[in-house]
C-alpha cells in the first residue's frame, strides 16, 4: 500500500494509472466503499462522500491513462485509505494528513515560550524535528516547546514530520517582539545634547501600546518616571513628561528621546518599557548615560565621570601630544599645578577612547 503524507490546508494529488494509455472508466472510493468521484465517458461524476466539494480530477490526463484524485483544503479527518478502481484492478493509497500550528500567537515577546502542536490522524506515530532560524534543532512528538525565545529565533521555523519513512515539511513564521538591543550606553561631555534611540527588532503594519521610561540617576536615592507615552498605529503621543530634564520625544518610530544637555545629575541608567496591545508582558531596553566634566579650580585640574562605568574603564588626564600625567581606574582624576596648554580628559576601554573633553589651562604670571 502506497503512503502519501499531506498538510492540513494544502492540496494533495493521489495518482492512479491504468496500463492502457486511454480514457477508460475509473472510480475513487474511500475505505468505507463510498464513491468519491469517477467518470462517465468524458464527464466527471461525484459520489456522496464528505469530500464532494473538495475533490477533483485532471481530465486532461485521462487520455494518457492517468486518473488522479485531487483533494483541496485538506483536513486531518481526510486521512484514510483511498481506493482507485480501474481495469478490474484496485490501487490503494493511504493518505495521512498532518497539521502543525503554534498554539499561541506567532508574535511572541522575547523571553516567552513557543509551543508547536502537531495534529495527526488516529493510529499514526509521527516524529517531528524543527530547525530554528539560528540553526537550533529540537525534536518531539505531538508537542514541541522552546522556552526563553531570543531575538535570533525570529524568522522561519522549518519542521519536518516523519511517518512511515515519508516526510512532510512545515514552515512557520515566528516574530519575536523585542528591542534591537537589550542595553545601550551613551557617553557625553557635560552640556552636550543627548539622544536615546530605542529601535524595535520587528516591523508590523499597526503597532499599538503604551510605554514609560524610568530613570535611576546615580546621585538619586530612588528611580523616577521621566516620561509616559502611548503608541497608536506607530504614532507616538506623550502623555506625561517630567519638567527636569526637559525631555522631547519623537512622534514616530523608532522611539527616540532627546535631552537638551547632559548634566552630572542626569547620569545614570534608565529602563524603557513598552506594553503592546493584546500581549502579556512588556518589552524592555536599558539605557545608560555617562557624563564627563573637566574643570580647573585654582591650581587643581580635575576630570570626573558620572554614571554606570565598568571597573575596567580608564580615566586619564594628559597634556596634548604628551604622555598621560595620570591614569586610573577611578571616576575622578586630577593634576595639581598643571602646566599651561590644552589638556585632554579621556575615558577609554582597552585603549579605545569612549569620551574626551578638552580644557585649556592658561599660563599663570
Amino acid at each position: 500500500k502506497k503512503v502519501v503524507l499531506g498538510k492540513k490546508g494544502d492540496t494533495v494529488e493521489l495518482t492512479c494509472t491504468a496500463s492502457q494509455k486511454k480514457s477508460i472508466q475509473f472510480h475513487w472510493k474511500n475505505s468505507n466503499q463510498i464513491k468519491i468521484l469517477g467518470n462517465q465517458g468524458s464527464f466527471l461524476t461525484k459520489g456522496p462522500s464528505k469530500l464532494n466539494d473538495r475533490a477533483d480530477s485532471r481530465r486532461s490526463l485521462w487520455d494518457q491513462g492517468n486518473f488522479p484524485l485531487i483533494i483541496k483544503n485538506l483536513k486531518i479527518e481526510d486521512s484514510d485509505t483511498y481506493i482507485c478502481e480501474v481495469e478490474d484492478q484496485k490501487e490503494e493509497v493511504q493518505l495521512l494528513v498532518f497539521g502543525l500550528t503554534a498554539n499561541s500567537d506567532t508574535h511572541l515577546l522575547q523571553g516567552q515560550s513557543l509551543t508547536l502542536t502537531l495534529e495527526s490522524p488516529p493510529g499514526s506515530s509521527p516524529s517531528v524535528q524543527c530547525r530554528s532560524p539560528r540553526g537550533k534543532n529540537i525534536q518531539g512528538g505531538k508537542t514541541l516547546s522552546v522556552s526563553q525565545l531570543e531575538l535570533q529565533d525570529s524568522g522561519t521555523w522549518t519542521c519536518t514530520v516523519l511517518q512511515n519513512q515519508k516526510k512532510v515539511e512545515f514552515k512557520i513564521d515566528i516574530v519575536v517582539l523585542a528591542f534591537q538591543k537589550a542595553s545601550s550606553i551613551v557617553y557625553k561631555k557635560e552640556g552636550e545634547q543627548v539622544e536615546f534611540s530605542f529601535p524595535l527588532a520587528f516591523t508590523v503594519e499597526k503597532l499599538t501600546g503604551s510605554g514609560e521610561l524610568w530613570w535611576q540617576a546615580e546621585r538619586a536615592s530612588s528611580s523616577k518616571s521621566w516620561i509616559t507615552f502611548d503608541l497608536k498605529n506607530k504614532e507616538v503621543s506623550v502623555k506625561w513628561v517630567t519638567q527636569d530634564p526637559k525631555l522631547q520625544m519623537g512622534k514616530k518610530l523608532p522611539l527616540h528621546l532627546t535631552l537638551p544637555q547632559a548634566l552630572p545629575q542626569y547620569a545614570g541608567s534608565g529602563n524603557l518599557t513598552l506594553a503592546l496591545e493584546a500581549k502579556t508582558g512588556k518589552l524592555h531596553q536599558e539605557v545608560n548615560l555617562v557624563v564627563m566634566r573637566a574643570t580647573q579650580l585654582q591650581k587643581n585640574l580635575t576630570c570626573e565621570v558620572w554614571g554606570p562605568t565598568s571597573p575596567k574603564l580608564m580615566l586619564s588626564l594628559k597634556l596634548e601630544n604628551k604622555e598621560a600625567k595620570v591614569s586610573k581606574r577611578e571616576k575622578a582624576v586630577w593634576v595639581l599645578n598643571p602646566e599651561a596648554g590644552m589638556w585632554q580628559c579621556l575615558l577609554s576601554d582597552s585603549g579605545q577612547v569612549l569620551l574626551e573633553s578638552n580644557i585649556k589651562v592658561l599660563p599663570t604670571w
Epitope: 545634547q193 543627548v194 539622544e195 520625544m249 512622534k251 514616530k252 527616540h256 532627546t258
Partner: antibody, heavy 119, light 107 residues
C-alpha cells in the same frame, strides 16, 4: 489626485468664533495625520494644530491652546478648526495640510482661507 | 517647544548662484525636518523631507543635509523660478515649529 479645500474664513469681531472646514478628496482620511498652519499678513508660517489619523490625539500651539479645537469627520473626509475667543493676532490665512503616511512632512496643502479679526 | 533658528532672514543672489540656507534645532530632532518653498499668495510646497530626501517632482538642484542639530538647504544653481521664501519645519514632535523664513531675492 489628493486635494484639500478650506472654507469658513471671514471677518469676525474680537472675542467671536469661527469654524474652518477642510474638505479632502482622493484619500482615505483616517490614514493620515492632518494639520492647520497659518500665516499672518507679511509674516512667516506658524503651525497651529494637528490631529492623528485615528482622530484620537490632538495637538495645539501654545498661542491657541484652550481657544481652538481641531476635529475630523472621517465619514465626510473633512477636517475642522473651531476657533473661539478670537483675537486680532489670529488674523491670518489658514491652510490645512496632510502629512505623508510613513513620514511626518506635509506633502499636500490647501489653497488657504482668510480669517480677519477686527472690530 | 523646540525652537528652530533659521538664517539668513533674507538673501540676494543671482541666477546660477549656489545658495545655502541653514536651520538649527534647539533639541536633537533626528532627520525629522522638511524644507518648504512659498511664493506670494500661494500655499507652501515641500521640497525636501527627512532632512535630505527630495520630494517627487522637485528639481535635483535642491538638496538637504544634516550635521547634528544643524540642517542645510542648498540650491546648486539658482533658476528664476527659485526666488521665493523658504521655511524649515521640525516635525519630530508636537508642537511642530517652523523657522522664521528666508526671503530669497534677485540681486
Amino acid at each position: 489626485e489628493v486635494e484639500l479645500l478650506e472654507s469658513g474664513g471671514g471677518l469676525v469681531q474680537p472675542g467671536g468664533s469661527l469654524r474652518l472646514s477642510c474638505a479632502a478628496s482622493g484619500l482615505t482620511f483616517s490614514t493620515f495625520a492632518m494639520s492647520w498652519v497659518r500665516q499672518a499678513p507679511g509674516k512667516g508660517l506658524e503651525w497651529v494644530s494637528g490631529i492623528s489619523g485615528s482622530g484620537e490625539n490632538t495637538y495645539y500651539a501654545d498661542s491657541v491652546k484652550g481657544r481652538f479645537t481641531i476635529t475630523s469627520d472621517n465619514s465626510k473626509n473633512t477636517l475642522y478648526l473651531q476657533m473661539n475667543s478670537l483675537r486680532a493676532e489670529d488674523t491670518a490665512v489658514y491652510y490645512c495640510a496632510k502629512e505623508g503616511y510613513n513620514w511626518n512632512y506635509m506633502d499636500v496643502w490647501g489653497k488657504g482661507t482668510t480669517v480677519t479679526v477686527s472690530s | 517647544a523646540i525652537q528652530m533658528t533659521q538664517s539668513p532672514s533674507s538673501l540676494s543672489a543671482s541666477v546660477g548662484d549656489r545658495v545655502t540656507i541653514t536651520c538649527r534645532a534647539s533639541h536633537g530632532i533626528r532627520n525629522d525636518l522638511g524644507w518648504y518653498q512659498q511664493k506670494p499668495g500661494k500655499a507652501p510646497k515641500v521640497l525636501i523631507y527627512e532632512a535630505s530626501s527630495l520630494q517627487s517632482g522637485v528639481p535635483s538642484r535642491f538638496s538637504g543635509s544634516r550635521s547634528g542639530t544643524d540642517f542645510t538647504l542648498t540650491i546648486s544653481s539658482l533658476q528664476p523660478e527659485d526666488f521665493a521664501t523658504y521655511y524649515c519645519l521640525q516635525d519630530y514632535t508636537y508642537p511642530y515649529t517652523f523657522g522664521q523664513g528666508t526671503k530669497l531675492e534677485i540681486k
